[in-house]
């Protein structure tokens, strides 16, 4: 298989609510016209599936109705967000790309973003 | 370890018809990209078709009009039907798995099965 660099950030924070968006950018040796968008995370060693998407070069990335990932495409750019997080969480999240048409396939595989996710602090009782 | 098992080469007439099968372990079509390579005496391997998970293929220039790639995810099987087969056909197919498996690459393929185009 030939090899593509993907570009993510390194780190993000997620939201008081538990939300977290970063972009995968990766560097499409010509124009696909079907990419696989996934997302792992790896933690004390191990790799887990988050979720993945097929999408069709100009339609919308649509994740499966369960999942807890979002995202919307424009050129050789996805924006993800997964959303659900908590503290537990935390981890590093890895963008992996497959270009599966027009051949030849091309895997690249981005070096992981680092997300924090703090669980909010229970409000105090407040007594008036 | 996905297995990929090739049937239904033989010997055939110039102008005539063949239909290949890969039949695979598991159930690999719904993530990768499934194809049909062959390679000639003293030629290198190329792809002959392909089918994505998501439904496109691609033909090589040379096959075209003749030959047809389709899959049967209830059975993990994959097909090639050749027709108006040529001398030039003359190879040994191979079925190949492209994709990958979380943070591995993964590129499988079948024994081959020999086609032969003659008269």
């Known amino acids: 298989c030939k090899a593509m660099h993907v570009a993510q950030p390194a780190v993000v924070l997620a939201s008081s609510r538990g939300i977290a968006s970063f972009v995968c950018e990766y560097a499409s040796p010509g124009k696909a016209t079907e990419v696989r968008v996934t997302v792992l995370r790896q933690a004390d060693s191990q790799v887990t599936e988050v979720c993945a998407a097929t999408y069709m070069m100009g339609n919308e990335l649509t994740f499966l109705d369960d999942s807890i990932c979002t995202g919307t495409s424009s050129g050789n750019q996805v924006n993800l967000t997964i959303q659900g997080l908590r503290a537990m969480d935390t981890g590093l999240y890895i963008c992996k790309v497959e270009l599966m048409y027009p051949p030849p396939y091309y895997l690249g595989i981005g070096n992981g973003t680092q997300i924090y996710v703090i669980d909010p602090e229970p409000c105090p009782d407040s007594d008036f | 370890e996905v297995q990929l098992v090739e049937s239904g080469g033989g010997l055939v007439q110039p102008g005539g018809s063949l239909r290949l099968s890969c039949a695979a372990s598991?159930?690999?079509?719904?993530?990768?990209?499934m194809g049909w390579y062959r390679q000639a005496p003293g030629k290198q391997r190329d792809l002959v078709a392909s089918?994505?998970?998501?439904?496109?293929?691609y033909y090589a220039d040379s096959v075209k009009g003749r030959f047809t790639i389709s899959r049967d995810g209830a059975k993990n099987t994959v097909y090639l039907q050749m027709n108006s087969l040529k001398p030039e056909d003359t190879a040994v197919y191979y079925c190949?798995?492209?994709?990958?498996?979380?943070?591995?690459?993964?590129?499988?393929w079948g024994q081959g099965t020999q086609v032969t185009v003659s008269s």
């Open positions: 190949n798995a492209r994709g990958s498996i979380l943070l591995d690459p993964i590129n499988y």
């Open positions: 089918i994505t998970p998501g439904g496109n293929i």
């Open positions: 598991g159930n690999i079509f719904t993530r990768n990209v």
